[in-house]
Interface confidence: low
């Protein structure tokens, strides 16, 4: 007999859940020498503990510290790339340049990237058939905890000069409910971050406007500037040319036209 | 930790061409630029291209524009380098080399190397 | 292109004395130089890159300073082992180039 389930407004969780989260960590830390030690297994088991038989609008970034602590991982300074509703072409440039991270390039990032989980009150299983909305239901839900958590880490540990990519297209290019704007603004050390390089992604073919002027760009550079870090703000009007300059700089239309620099 | 891992010697006679294979194994292949250097004998070290395999986006230095051709085969981690109309002063070691890079423009240095192939061109 | 220029050509110096090699480009190449070692009949081995940082496994003796045209690598205290050619690699602008490289024998 089929026990009764709470019905929540968002997706269930991922079909195959456990068996794509142990996949992808056996296969990143194949691919990452660095991560050679992480015990895959052990990841799962923190993974599965921070949400199983716990409420599912009830979580919190302790429910997460195991994970976070096996999870342990340090990019180098000035490799850092954040970014805002633009997460395709942020980790189409990383594929690039593959010396640039994004969160979903770091291990706990990838593990979780696109993925939907959740269990319920006092049972051991995954609910497949619907998890909270973030809107409709609940905030403190397994997947917004998580990403708030690893958001909040990848930010503190973040040094050097930082990278935000940021969609010119929308009406908020900057949008302080974002994640980066919620949460990894905030979590940038001053004393270890010297300066946030906003990247303004256009959208248009013929949009030559600069929108490093924007009044959400020049919010984003009042809350970074309070906090003692510089600001620099970069137009990146043809993301397709850009990308194509990435992956062949030596093309001479490459040498100016796909981005213009504003210093503040 | 990844090995690059090259073809044995050849030798070629002079106008013909020559291909040299470089076999990733032990890690990621695909994302990386596999560069190709060569060096003559009792000589310093030349760039001559490059690949991206992910992106199949290859590059030559404009010396050996038209004569060289680099490809990659994603499926066996092998990456290629041909060289055509060979002569006498193509006479070297030639090496396969894992880029790592810089953002933005793709600057890089190269981190692990292939042990080397000699193709002598003599008649 | 760039031009890369080594010196000395060759260095003569006694095991456990300090050896200081130079590099200098034709134009600015920013931090964006690698040093290279090489011994007889094996493949370069990447000691230093962005100028100053020591790649992985390298001891400490071998470290790089400078940026824009001059650089220098230094090895603090001659080990046997280290004995070889060394060469310096600018990838700031197309095509990357080696300098023609220093010969660091035994004095």
């Known amino acids: 007999v089929p026990r009764w389930r709470q019905q929540w407004s968002g997706s269930g969780t991922t079909s195959r859940f456990p068996e794509t989260v142990l996949a992808r960590c056996v296969k990143y830390t194949e691919v990452h020498p660095e991560m050679r030690h992480v015990d895959c297994q052990s990841v799962w088991d923190a993974f599965k503990g921070a949400f199983i038989s716990k409420y599912p609008c009830n979580i919190t970034e302790e429910d997460y510290q195991p994970l976070v602590k096996l999870g342990t991982q340090t990019v180098p300074c000035n490799k850092t790339l954040l970014w805002s509703r633009i997460k395709d072409l942020a980790h189409q440039f990383t594929q690039v340049q593959r010396d640039m991270f994004t969160l979903e390039d770091m291990l706990l990032g990838y593990l979780a990237d696109d993925l939907t989980w959740c269990g319920e009150f006092n049972t051991f299983e995954i609910n497949y058939q619907s998890c909270p909305d973030w809107r409709k239901d609940c905030s403190n839900n397994p997947v917004s905890v998580f990403w708030k958590t690893v958001s909040r880490r990848f930010a503190e540990t973040a040094c050097g000069v930082v990278h935000v990519m940021l969609n010119g297209s929308r009406s908020k290019i900057f949008d302080k409910n974002s994640t980066f704007g919620s949460v990894e603004v905030h979590n940038l050390q001053p004393e270890k971050v010297q300066a946030l390089e906003a990247w303004v992604i256009h959208g248009g073919r013929e949009d030559s406007r600069d929108l490093c002027q924007d009044p959400t760009i020049k919010e984003l550079e009042s809350i970074i500037s309070k906090r003692n870090i510089r600001f620099f703000c970069k137009n990146i009007y043809r993301p397709d040319k850009f990308l194509q300059c990435v992956k062949n700089p030596e093309d001479s239309s490459c040498l100016s036209g796909i981005h213009h620099h504003h210093h503040h | 930790q990844v090995q690059l891992v090259q073809s044995g010697a050849e030798v070629k006679k002079p106008g013909s061409s020559v291909k040299v294979s470089c076999k990733a194994s032990?890690?990621?292949?695909?994302?990386?630029?596999i560069g190709w250097v060569r060096q003559a004998p009792g000589q310093g070290l030349e760039w001559m291209g490059r690949?991206?395999?992910?992106?199949?986006?290859?590059h030559y230095a404009q010396k050996f524009q038209g004569r060289v051709t680099i490809t990659a085969d994603e499926s066996t981690s092998t990456a290629y380098m041909e060289l055509s109309s060979l002569r006498s002063e193509d006479t070297a070691v030639y090496y396969c080399?894992?880029?790592?890079?810089?953002?933005?423009?793709?600057?890089?240095?190269?981190?692990?190397w292939g042990q080397g192939t000699l193709v002598t061109v003599s008649s | 292109e760039i031009v890369m220029t080594q010196s000395p050509a060759t260095l003569s110096v006694s095991p456990g004395e300090r050896a200081t090699l130079s590099c200098r480009a034709s134009?600015?190449?920013?931090?964006?130089l690698a040093w290279y070692q090489q011994k007889p009949g094996q493949a370069p081995r990447l000691l230093i890159y962005?100028?100053?940082t020591r790649a992985t496994g390298i001891p400490a003796r071998f470290s790089g300073s400078g940026s824009g045209t001059e650089f220098t690598l230094t090895i603090s205290s001659l080990q046997s082992e280290d004995f070889a050619v060394y060469y310096c690699?600018?990838?700031?602008?197309?095509?990357?180039?080696f300098g023609q490289g220093t010969k660091v024998e035994i004095k």
């Open positions: 690699q600018q990838y700031n602008n197309w095509p990357w180039t």
């Open positions: 032990g890690g990621s292949f695909s994302n990386y630029a």
């Open positions: 080399a894992r880029g790592l890079g810089y953002y933005l423009y793709s600057s890089y240095y190269f981190d692990i």
């Open positions: 134009q600015s190449v920013s931090s964006n």
């Open positions: 690949i991206i395999p992910v992106l199949d986006a290859a």
């Open positions: 962005g100028a100053s």
